[in-house]
């Protein structure tokens, strides 16, 4: 038994052009988490459950708004390791997703939104009991910079965390053949129960007599090396050391399979053999199932019951993405018509339609006119999703109703006085003006502006308004 | 306030299509996916399927070889038809609304017992 | 599929009693994807908590959801005589979307 730590260093843009826009802004502030999902890397193995070594979860990272106009920087980071303890032996190589994970602190409904930022994966050789390993992988613009250790909990301990140790009997020394438990030396080493002989660097066991081998070694005792290229290979000229054919370059060179995919080649280039897990043409997939929990924001996972069949997520409305992580903005697509406000609820998209319109997508013009009648002999006229009455000479109002007074707005210029006719209305004018208006005034000499004044009337003469 | 309204026939022979209806009044069906739910009589609750406005649908296994579920969002209903009944068909069929913040039922019909007999 | 085991079948309370009532599922159910329903006699069922912990509108604080993984628990406290119905919970983490078998409260 034990525990995998992961410490995360850094989240941030990685090197390189096409740096990435920070996730969060002044108007959708967010945090980041992460998750950790280890599965043994014994590619033989028969269908091991999803996560089979352990998950974990970080808490939430402190909560981040971006500067307008800055750069992405290194984002903020949750405290403290995650830990991912393991119950049985160690398998020694092992692989890893670790996802970020942003959650956004706006006004959500139905809770803070998740959306996957990045997931990186890996595989990974590595002893139990040994130093802090570091690693940098990079999620399309993004890079995170992590180190990982695996560790005994006591009475546990070696390279696969199978070897026990006991407090000692005598005060001085373990007994015969017994050495003592680094870094625990006030303990003892418990007597072997492996088969005699079995590499206790390479081998481990869970039953008495048993010699089972870490991935990598083979043989009865485990201190074999599993051969990673063949000496019989036809290619390249004939090592002297080593009586082996050295291989030329090949299309397996290099392994270009990911994720501890063994290559092998073809008659036209090369096929990788992915360890469960991972798929892909360089195994650089991983077989995320149903049982991770890939599905965000209320997602429903369909299919994917097992690696090697993809799921797929039922996204609830408002969130799209293979892992429901994006929410829509669905106003951005302008769906309401004639100039409607549009309203994202979440469950629903609401349109708030101008006067004059109406249905969901304020698509419906209204007949303003429909049922309106203007009174005292007005028309209706359209307009701009309102009704508006031409009132006939006389009369007002929004419906005509009322009985115009057209003397109120002060038509007559220069302090002549307004009468009120029965075909609209009459202008006295003041010594000097003449016009409909009193608008002009008479030139001293008796001539006035007015090209000639209308017949039968004299300037000075009250003129009607026609 | 959302209104669910499941209409079909109480009594379908065996081996004949059972089809039901659930007209939707409250909410635009364009909004929310839409299932079906049975229960037989005294025991518990069978997830039929679901559908989005969209097309989508997802069916319980078991069921998936006789079932289609349909969404007319002009009338704002969907159907569900189950083909080949036998009596084990027996049940009360519920329409549901399916929840924005996950795969729940947040609003159902009343049911309509449907009866499978000769 | 996840296979939901709701516990008691039955259970015999009196009415200001508290009420435990329990479902296990057969695989860890993720983010908490689990919802309670209330089912009276001739009637659908009724929503009462999503996400193991929220109450849905217009749900009495009586009720509360918890657990996480496997194990969720359902409890009334000060039990209402219009409180003893069948509830059953359901999982939507995963497809197929799976009810439990219910558990029956009755009158002591």
């Known amino acids: 038994a034990g525990v995998f730590e992961l410490q995360i260093h850094s989240f941030g843009p990685g090197p390189g052009p096409g740096a990435p826009r920070s996730p969060c802004s002044a108007r959708l502030p967010c945090r980041l988490f992460f998750r950790v999902c280890l599965k043994p890397g014994l590619s033989e193995e028969a269908a091991e459950s999803p996560c089979a070594l352990g998950a974990a979860l970080s808490a939430r990272g402190p909560v981040y708004t971006e500067q307008p106009g800055a750069p992405a920087p290194d984002l903020p980071l949750p405290d403290g390791l995650l830990q991912v303890p393991f119950r049985d032996a160690w398998p020694g190589t092992f692989s890893f997703i670790i996802e970020t994970w942003r959650e956004e602190l706006g006004d959500q409904i139905g809770g803070p939104a998740w959306s996957l930022l990045a997931r990186v994966a890996g595989r990974r050789r590595l002893a139990a009991g040994g130093p802090w390993a570091r690693d940098i992988q990079r999620a399309g613009a993004w890079e995170l910079r992590f180190s990982y250790r695996a560790r005994c909990e006591p009475p546990a301990v070696g390279t696969a965390c199978t070897r026990l140790c006991r407090p000692r009997s005598a005060p001085s020394r373990c007994g015969p053949g017994l050495r003592p438990c680094a870094p625990l030396e006030d303990e003892c080493e418990a007597p072997l129960v492996c088969r005699a002989g079995c590499s206790p660097e390479h081998g481990f066991c869970e039953q008495p007599g048993e010699c089972r081998c870490l991935e990598g070694w083979t043989g009865p005792l485990c201190t074999v090396p599993v051969s990673t290229s063949s000496c019989l290979s036809p290619r390249g000229p004939s090592s002297a050391t080593t009586g082996c054919l050295v291989p030329g370059p090949g299309p397996c060179d290099g392994n270009p399979c990911a994720n501890g995919g063994s290559c092998s080649e073809t008659p036209r280039s090369f096929e990788c053999t992915c360890p469960r897990g991972f798929y892909g043409l360089r195994c650089e997939v991983s077989g995320v199932t149903c049982a991770d929990g890939p599905c965000f924001n209320g997602g429903l996972c369909v299919g994917g019951a097992d690696p090697d069949s993809a799921y797929i997520c039922h996204c609830p409305p408002g969130f799209q993405g293979s892992n429901c992580e994006k929410r829509v903005d669905r106003c951005s697509l302008q769906p309401c018509r004639n100039g409607g406000l549009c309203l994202d609820l979440g469950h629903a998209l609401r349109c708030r339609c101008r006067a004059g319109f109406a249905g969901p997508r304020c698509e419906h013009d209204l007949d303003d006119c429909a049922g309106r009648a203007c009174a005292n002999g007005g028309t209706c006229v359209e307009g701009g999703g309102a009704h508006r009455c031409s009132c006939a000479l006389g009369f007002g109002g929004r419906d005509c109703r009322e009985r115009a007074d057209p003397c109120a707005a002060r038509p007559c210029a220069h302090g002549g006085r307004c009468y009120a006719h029965f075909s609209g209305l009459v202008c006295a004018c003041a010594p000097g003006y003449m016009g409909a208006r009193c608008e002009f005034p008479v030139h001293p000499d008796g001539a006035s502006a007015l090209p000639a004044a209308p017949p039968g009337l004299r300037p000075g003469d009250p003129q009607r308004y026609l | 306030q959302v209104q669910l309204q499941e209409s079909g026939p109480g009594l379908v022979k065996p081996s004949e299509t059972l089809s039901l209806t659930c007209t939707v009044s409250g909410a635009s069906i364009s909004s929310f996916y839409w299932s079906w739910i049975r229960q037989p009589p005294g025991k518990g609750l069978e997830w039929i399927g679901y559908?989005?406005?969209?097309?989508?649908?997802n069916y319980n296994p078991s069921l998936k070889s006789r079932v289609t579920i349909s969404v007319d969002t002009s009338k704002n209903q969907f159907s569900l038809k189950l083909s080949s009944v036998t009596a084990a068909d027996t049940a009360v069929y519920y329409c549901?609304?399916?929840?924005?913040?996950?795969?729940?039922?947040?609003?159902w019909g009343q049911g309509t017992l449907v009866t499978v007999s000769s | 599929e996840i296979v939901l085991t709701q516990s008691p079948g039955t259970l015999s309370l009196s009415p200001g009693e508290s009420a435990t009532l329990s479902c296990r599922a057969s695989q860890s159910v993720n983010k908490n994807y689990l919802a309670w329903y209330q089912q009276k006699p001739g009637q659908a069922p009724r929503l009462l908590i999503y996400?193991?912990?929220s109450r849905a509108t217009g749900i009495p604080d009586r009720f509360s959801g918890s657990g996480s993984g496997t194990d969720f628990t359902l409890t009334i406290s000060r039990l209402e005589p219009e409180d003893f119905a069948v509830y059953y919970c359901q999982q939507y983490d995963r497809s197929p979307l799976t009810f439990g078998g219910g558990t029956r409260l009755e009158i002591k």
């Open positions: 996400g193991a912990s």
């Open positions: 549901a609304r399916i929840a924005v913040a996950g795969f729940f039922f947040d609003y």
């Open positions: 559908i989005y406005y969209s097309g989508t649908t």
